[in-house]
């Protein structure tokens, strides 16, 4: 005896003109209805209506209407999916991928998610990791080859190194940007002491005893001191580069002026200071001529020393 | 108790070179926190830094720009001393002469142990 | 490099007074680099204070050192009969520097 097929309950959707049509049922088989899947669900063939038929064994499709997740309620961050479908049904699994830099929780560079009866099976998560740095002259205390975003991986120096003033162990931190820096154990031999001191000069920073390689320190001047050559130096090798020099001025005073009977060009100074280098325009006293060459007049001043022209 | 025990001659003739040791007891020249210093003090100059040796690691000696080109301070491990060597020495260089224990950190430098002092005269 | 000067050249007071000693550096000094002695006839000095205030081990709390950049003060609350001596500053910011003294005598 053929069953007849009673009016379908067809959870998340239901039949078209269901009012109407109740008065058909049961239904014998062989018979087909429209049917529709509310918002977020879908038929088997994954459209929002189809026909579901009356067989011997009864309705099918025997699940109507399937969840449907969209791509859209995917939030990932640091990741990405490359498959090209919008929505995707009950059970589908669908793949994502990490950035570089980033993993999942299970520290692999993808994973998947499912489409499950209540959406998705989970958010993507692409965590920040830091992969095992490359050491010098140093060792990890760790033989993790992944650590994750604030992870600390400990680290010690070889015999004969050091990180800093003495220490031989430290600490790096994975961050957003990777590790917060690069662990560099250097030659304890490779320090140095505190810079050379300068005539007329000074560092620009307090001195420390012990400075490690490639510190750099800078110097100055005295007022009116011209320096010469680079103003840092920096350690290398236990060694300090060539510190600068400060090269006197030429101190221009009234009373060399008035031995020479001569006056500054434009200036009533008392007392004027010049650098290497700098011209200084000298004239005659009023009343006095000169004695010596008119270039000598523009008398350049060279580390201190200035060869004042004559008026007689 | 940490001790310093300086000895060396109290007269030095103009040009020779003056020489200095300070002996440690308590303490060692190859701690990695202590500096070692000399000091001299004259009525003319007052009290004057000269310079300092210490061990990090390795081996450093800073000197006062004063008496750069003719100092030197020497380590001693195995008597646990330091030596004061100041060579051409003038009348100027009359004063007494200190030696220092510095246990500042990386940035300080301050003297929290001082030995009893040397007269040092420079005269012919 | 740096000077200090100190002042006054000679202070006059009685036990139980208070000295206030001035340091005054030519360039800035961070605090953190400046400490005092104090000499007695025929002694080698001693350190009273490092880091422009911390005291050094054993050294009474009527002593107390404050300021900083160019000016520097050294304070006795309280004097005692020991107390008087000489007293020196120094810097160690930029190779080391001592002030000439000031002389704490019984008045």
């Known amino acids: 005896e053929v069953k007849p097929c009673d009016f379908p309950e067809i959870q998340h959707g239901g039949l078209y003109y269901k009012s109407l049509r109740r008065l058909y049922f049961p239904a014998a088989a062989g018979q087909s209805y429209s049917y529709y899947c509310d918002q977020n669900f879908v038929t088997p063939s994954g459209s929002y209506w189809d026909y579901i038929h009356c067989t011997q064994d009864g309705w099918s499709p025997t699940v109507p209407c399937l969840r449907t997740c969209s791509k859209s309620d995917i939030e990932i961050e640091n990741g990405f999916i490359s498959e090209s479908s919008s929505i995707y049904i009950l059970n589908k699994e669908i793949q994502y991928k990490c950035k570089p830099g980033y993993a999942t929780a299970d520290g692999n560079s993808s994973g998947s998610i499912t489409c499950l009866q209540n959406g998705w099976s989970a958010q993507p998560i692409c965590i920040k990791f830091c992969d095992m740095p490359v050491f010098e002259n140093s060792r990890a205390k760790s033989n993790g080859m992944r650590f994750k975003l604030h992870d600390t991986l400990d680290y010690e120096c070889y015999d004969g190194y050091e990180i800093s003033y003495g220490n031989t162990t430290g600490s790096i931190v994975c961050g957003e940007d990777g590790w917060s820096h690069f662990p560099t154990c250097y030659n304890s031999s490779e320090k140095c002491g505190p810079p050379p001191p300068i005539s007329n000069g000074d560092t620009t920073s307090f001195l420390l005893k012990v400075y490690v390689p490639q510190s750099r320190v800078e110097y100055q001047c005295q007022s009116y001191y011209e320096l010469q050559g680079s103003n840092y130096v920096t350690c290398s090798n236990g060694e300090w580069s060539e510190p600068p020099r400060c090269i006197h001025p030429c101190i221009i005073t009234e009373e060399n002026m008035n031995k020479n009977n001569i006056q500054l060009k434009g200036k009533s100074d008392i007392k004027y200071y010049a650098k290497t280098g700098d011209t200084i325009e000298f004239m005659c006293k009023l009343g006095y001529n000169a004695n010596t060459s008119v270039l000598s007049f523009q008398a350049v001043c060279r580390e201190g020393i200035v060869e004042y022209p004559r008026c007689e | 108790q940490v001790q310093l025990q300086q000895s060396g001659p109290g007269l030095v003739k103009p040009s020779q070179t003056l020489s200095l040791t300070c002996a440690i007891s308590?303490?060692?020249?190859?701690?990695?926190?202590?500096?070692w210093n000399w000091i001299r003090q004259s009525p003319s100059r007052g009290l004057e830094w000269l310079g300092t040796?210490?061990?990090?690691?390795?081996?450093?000696?800073v000197y006062a720009v004063s008496v750069k080109s003719r100092i030197t301070i020497n380590p001693d491990t195995s008597k646990n001393q330091f030596s004061l060597h100041l060579n051409s020495v003038t009348p100027e260089d009359t004063a007494i002469y200190f030696c220092?224990?510095?246990?500042?950190?990386?940035?300080?430098?301050?003297?929290?142990?001082w030995g009893r002092g040397t007269l040092v005269t420079v005269s012919s | 490099e740096i000077v200090l000067t100190q002042s006054p050249g000679t202070l006059s007071l009685s036990p139980g007074e208070r000295a206030t000693l001035s340091c005054r550096a030519s360039?800035?000094?961070?605090?953190?680099?400046l400490a005092w002695y104090q000499q007695k006839p025929g002694q080698s000095p001693r350190l009273l204070i490092y880091?422009?205030?911390s005291r050094a081990t054993g050294i009474p709390d009527r002593f107390s050192g404050s300021g900083s950049g160019t000016d520097f003060t050294l304070t006795i609350s309280r004097l005692e009969p020991e107390d008087f001596a000489v007293y020196y500053c120094?810097?160690?910011?930029?190779?080391?520097?001592f002030g000439g003294g000031t002389k704490l005598e019984i008045k």
């Open positions: 040796t210490y061990y990090r690691s390795k081996w450093f000696n």
């Open positions: 120094q810097q160690y910011g930029r190779s080391v520097t």
């Open positions: 360039q800035s000094v961070s605090s953190s680099y």
């Open positions: 880091g422009a205030s």
């Open positions: 308590g303490d060692s020249v190859s701690s990695n926190s202590a500096s």
């Open positions: 220092t224990r510095d246990r500042g950190d990386l940035l300080h430098w301050y003297f929290d142990l």
